[in-house]
């Protein structure tokens, strides 16, 4: 197993409709093939396999398990949306990559971006 | 409706190893997310460690992390926990439980709607 250096924001912020974006950029030192995506959440004292996907370079990623998770590659970037998320799923989110094939195996994990989810506050009744 | 049935415990020393399995009865088990959790008399019911329907996906407490290890086998309808260097503060009641919802970021968190009748877990020093 052969390291790998991963980059990813610091913080990003949530919509108000839950919905998080932020990119996972590797330094690939070869031409990979087939690359493995996995978003971890450490927080709570828990750590969380949110969502993975394994997708061949230049095809978009699938998404197992009713995903919460959609994204897209571009080169050594990989853009992850996560949708549905709620104030208390606020926490560190961690982008780790592998390098599946061709040998040699390239395993990276990123520092973690921490998103932050705000519940939008319930629209007062209105007359009108 | 599923039916829950836990195995595997037992009172073993510190160190040592145990595999608890669940069995599960009902047509759907496939569609679960499934958790085990773990209850000290007096204390409330904890989380320990939750897999995705499918089995791809995990989430665990901190304080297991590296030393258990779940896993599923939807074909035979089983869940299963590896419990590796045990510590006696790993002594419990433990449970499994299925929840009907789709994986999320905060597993523990989902309804759990069935429970099994838990079993007993010791571990001396």
């Known amino acids: 197993c052969k390291a790998m250096h991963v980059a990813q924001p610091a913080v990003v912020l949530a919509s108000s409709r839950g919905i998080a974006s932020f990119v996972c950029e590797y330094a690939s030192p070869g031409k990979a093939t087939e690359v493995r995506v996995t978003v971890l959440r450490q927080a709570d004292s828990q750590v969380t396999e949110v969502c993975a996907a394994t997708y061949m370079m230049g095809n978009e990623l699938t998404f197992l398990d009713d995903s919460i998770c959609t994204g897209t590659s571009s080169g050594n970037q990989v853009n992850l949306t996560i949708q549905g998320l709620r104030a208390m799923d606020t926490g560190l989110y961690i982008c780790k990559v592998e390098l599946m094939y061709p040998p040699p195996y390239y395993l990276g994990i990123g520092n973690g971006t921490q998103i932050y989810v705000i519940d939008p506050e319930p629209c007062p009744d209105s007359d009108f | 409706e599923v039916q829950l049935v836990e195995s595997g415990g037992g009172l073993v020393q510190a160190g040592d190893s145990l595999r608890l399995s669940c069995a599960a009865s009902g047509r759907t088990f496939s569609n679960y997310v499934m958790g085990w959790f773990r209850q000290a008399p007096g204390k409330e019911r904890e989380f320990v460690s939750a897999?995705?329907?499918?089995?791809?996906?995990?989430s665990y407490t901190d304080s297991v992390k590296g030393r258990f290890a779940i896993s599923r086998d939807n074909a035979k309808k089983m869940l299963y926990l590896q419990m590796s260097s045990l510590k006696p503060e790993d002594t419990d009641v433990y449970y499994c439980?299925?929840?009907?919802?789709?994986?999320?970021?905060?597993?523990?968190?989902?309804?759990?709607?069935?429970w099994g009748q838990g079993t007993q877990v010791t571990v001396s020093s």
């Open positions: 439980a299925a929840a009907r919802g789709p994986w999320s970021a905060r597993p523990s968190l989902l309804t759990y709607d069935y």
């Open positions: 897999i995705s329907p499918s089995g791809t996906l995990t």
